[in-house]
Amino acid sequence: TPVVRKGRCSCISTNQGTIHLQSLKDLKQFAPSPSCEKIEIIATLKNGVQTCLNPDSADVKELIKKWEKQVSQKKKQKNGKKHQKKKVLKVRKSQRSRQKKTT
């Protein structure tokens, strides 16, 4: 989902090459705003380099879809782990209370 930009446009040029999902560390979409009238997409690569992507490119649109899918999957996994932790804690608590009763 596009982020609202603070300040003016960021991109001077756009990247012509194909960026692979595996090399992405972060992908930010900036929505048009009064200070910059166009959509801008800035990719942060795993090597720390930041590059502007062409918002009109079909490859970039596909990359955004894949990235968003990956992010939502990671969120689900995180939430699942939290849920499991809570269950484990509950089990441990009930075990303790049982042990106290038996002593």
Epitope: S10, I12, S13, T14, K38, I42, V49, N54
Partner: antibody
Framework: QVQLVESGGGVVQPGRSLRLSCTAS????????MHWVRQAPGKGLEWVAV????????YYADSVKGRFTISRDNSKNTLYLQMNSLRAEDTAVYYC?????????????????WGQGTTVTVSS | EIVLTQSPGTLSLSPGERATLSCRAS???????LAWYQQKPGQAPRLLIY???SRATGIPDRFSGSGSGTDFTLTISRLEPEDFAVYYC??????????FGPGTKVDIK
């Protein structure tokens, strides 16, 4: 092949105007930021102005602010520099240069393609 | 405004020798914003290094860039006859402006 060709230079009197052009070929002009850089005779390089790929970001050196205007026509693959109120100190070779692919406010990729330059002489 | 100073002004060396060129900034510069160019007489400049240490496309590996903060270095490990030229460092400032250093001339001893 990737090429930039400047034109429009010449001899002009102080206070007059001149428009430089830079025609690009061999790459997708509309995806790259473009610069004008000048070099006075026997001197070093001086950055003049930059325009973003879409034309909405424009920055100028203090020495030309209010007198020079950078613009582009992506349908013609051409970059322009409108120079008004010319002074003797504007005498130089003017180069157009392409901003590196993906350049932004966080990471600068340098000026990776340059034209051969056009000479502007301001003299009475 | 950040001012770039290059030293030495002229470096006289022989082919095969190592050249070390210095670029000093008046304030700290992000290495993401520093580039080096080569210019031969009567020719347009050529990009050598961007991001302080990344070689531009087609640049031989005898050219290398390093440094951070206020001190940056361009090293030519073994000078070839075609490397004798003027070298400029350049930074992308926050104003934003693109400042060049005064240049270092590398000539034949």
């Amino acid at each position: 092949q990737v090429q930039l060709v400047e034109s429009g230079g010449g001899v002009v009197q102080p206070g007059r105007s001149l428009r430089l052009s830079c025609t690009a070929s061999g790459f997708t002009f509309s995806q790259y930021g473009m610069h004008w850089v000048r070099q006075a005779p026997g001197k070093g390089l001086e950055w003049v102005a930059v325009i973003s790929y879409g034309g909405d970001i424009k920055y100028y050196a203090d020495s030309v602010k209010g007198r020079f205007t950078i613009s582009r026509d992506n349908s013609k693959n051409t970059l322009y520099l409108q120079m008004n109120s010319l002074r003797a100190e504007d005498t130089a070779v003017y180069y157009c240069a392409r901003e590196g692919e993906g350049s932004n406010i966080y990471y600068y990729y340098g000026m990776d393609v340059w034209g051969q330059g056009t000479t502007v002489t301001v003299s009475s | 405004e950040i001012v770039l100073t290059q030293s030495p002004g002229t470096l006289s060396l022989s082919p095969g020798e190592r050249a070390t060129l210095s670029c000093r900034a008046s304030q700290s510069v992000s290495s993401s914003y520093l580039a080096w160019y080569q210019q031969k007489p009567g020719q347009a400049p050529r990009l050598l290094i961007y991001g302080a240490s990344s070689r531009a496309t087609g640049i031989p590996d005898r050219f290398s860039g390093s440094g951070s903060g206020t001190d940056f270095t361009l090293t030519i490990s073994r000078l070839e006859p075609e490397d004798f030229a003027v070298y400029y460092c350049q930074q992308y400032g926050s104003s934003p402006i693109f400042t060049f250093g005064p240049g270092t001339k590398v000539d034949i001893k």
